[in-house]
């Protein structure tokens, strides 16, 4: 028996369902009574879901997995993973045994888009050219860790005096806080770009300082 899976990682958004595709070519006369199908975590070999002993044995993994029972006899051994979580990320092995056996691994990459950044300024009044200001760009609940870029109004990258911190919350999603310390010019726009490297999603925020009032 030959097992086939997609070579590219499966990218799934947090809280959506993902299908890990796996197929085998059944011989003529194949019946499900002969099938041992096991999905397991590749690294730890922890059972995820199985069809053995003549029946779907159900989920051994958070009760969020399912097979496609009507398609098994055709050789479709794919696994449905519901309400994907950050902790689901990793490699899954599809193991199929009929008379002989084969297995293959498929990677699940979890992702979540970052929110539109909110911008704050400190101090936020009585600003004069030459003042040192702190601009904070905050974006929430993304995954995996973001890449953060700062630019001025002319699109020139600002790399000095930038401090970025990323903290995972209880769901494993990251909140990003990036702080730019800059000396004010006569007027200017400062923009921050938060990029999700997996989704290639960019979230933009900017602040324009033109004396008073400030525009965000």
């Amino acid at each position: 028996v030959e097992v086939q899976v997609s070579e590219d990682p499966v990218v799934a958004l947090v809280d959506t369902d993902a299908t890990l595709r796996c197929s085998f070519s059944p011989e003529p006369g194949f019946s499900l009574a002969q099938l041992n199908l096991i999905w397991q975590l590749t690294d730890t070999k922890q059972l995820v879901h199985s069809f053995t002993e003549g029946r779907d044995q159900g989920s051994a993994y958070s009760n969020r997995t399912a097979l496609f029972p009507d398609l098994l006899v055709q050789g479709n051994a794919s696994l449905r993973l519901q309400r994907v979580r950050v902790t689901d990320e990793g490699s899954y092995t599809c193991f199929v045994s009929i008379q002989d056996f084969d297995s293959a691994a498929v990677s699940l990459q979890v992702a979540a888009p970052y929110s539109k950044p909110s911008m704050t300024l400190e101090p936020n009044k009585d600003l004069r050219p030459g003042n040192m200001v702190t601009i904070t760009c905050s974006s929430y609940q993304g995954y995996p860790e973001a890449e953060v870029f700062w630019k001025d109004g002319q699109g020139v990258p600002l790399t000095g005096n930038v401090t970025t911190s990323q903290m995972a919350n209880e769901r494993g999603l990251f909140d990003v806080h990036s702080v730019l310390r800059v000396v004010l010019g006569a007027n200017g726009t400062y923009s921050c770009l938060v990029r999700n490297p997996v989704l290639q999603q960019d979230a933009h925020g900017s602040v324009t300082i033109t004396g008073q009032p400030l525009t965000f």
Epitope: Q40, K45, S50, G58
Partner: antibody, heavy 115, light 106 residues
Framework: QVQLQQPGAELVKPGASVKLSCKAS????????MHWVKQRPGQGLEWIGM????????NYNEKFKSKATLTVDKSSSTAYMQLSSLTSEDSAVYYC????????WGQGTTLTVSS | DIQMTRHPSSLSASMGERVSLTCRAS??????LSWLQQKPDGTIKRLIY???TLDSGVPKRFSGSRSGSDYSLTISSLESEDFADYYC?????????FGGGTKLEI
């Protein structure tokens, strides 16, 4: 005929580890899940976990995840369960059983944890 | 986890008598239940699987049935070798769980 052979007894000291064995014969070892079950003296049966010899896939009762480690040696058709950091609470009879519906059982190994 | 509640915990009966033991499942187990017999020497043997299917070699006086979430093992006419402990085992969902066991005494 299907047979699951287990040593009769093991005596170990508290804090130590022990590796219990279950040698299978009379069937194709790699085709069936092997399960492990605990029975404390005068008590009922408790499911510890299971291992599929061919894939090496394991599934543990949450209660025993940090206590038991299941492995197999396909060449000798033997399943093993290692129990770590032993205390008197681990003194029990440990059974191996084939399949989830328990179609065949070993005779059980009596584990005594005592100094 | 699925709880399997057995009734009774012990039962005194005479040879030739008809007895029934029951296990109640706390959640749906769809008939995925075995009945096991444990002899005083610790030997465990499966009698019934899939709630009502008799294992080969098991005497016909043993039978299994289901009524909703209640699963019963009936011995139609007790013989001396039937005096033992009996357990139900649900294998519908992980972790698999056993009933507390019924001690059948003379």
């Amino acid at each position: 005929q299907v047979q699951l052979q287990q040593p009769g007894a093991e005596l170990v000291k508290p804090g130590a580890s022990v590796k219990l064995s279950c040698k299978a014969s009379g069937y194709t070892f790699t085709n069936y899940w092997m399960h492990w079950v605990k029975q404390r003296p005068g008590q009922g049966l408790e499911w510890i976990g299971m291992i599929h010899p061919n894939s090496g896939s394991t599934n543990y009762n949450e209660k025993f995840k940090s206590k038991a480690t299941l492995t197999v040696d396909k060449s000798s058709s033997t399943a093993y369960m290692q129990l770590s950091s032993l205390t008197s609470e681990d003194s029990a009879v440990y059974y191996c059983a084939r399949r989830g519906d328990g179609d065949y059982w070993g005779q059980g190994t009596t584990l005594t944890v005592s100094s | 986890d699925i709880q399997m509640t057995r009734h009774p915990s012990s039962l005194s009966a005479s040879m030739g008598e008809r007895v029934s033991l029951t296990c109640r499942a706390s959640q749906e187990i769809s008939g995925y239940l075995s009945w096991l017999q444990q002899k005083p020497d610790g030997t465990i043997k499966r009698l019934i699987y899939a709630a009502s299917t008799l294992d080969s070699g098991v005497p016909k006086r043993f039978s299994g049935s289901r009524s909703g979430s209640d699963y019963s093992l009936t011995i139609s006419s007790l013989e001396s070798e039937d005096f033992a402990d009996y357990y139900c085992l649900q294998y519908a969902s992980y972790p698999y769980t056993f009933g507390g066991g019924t001690k059948l005494e003379i």
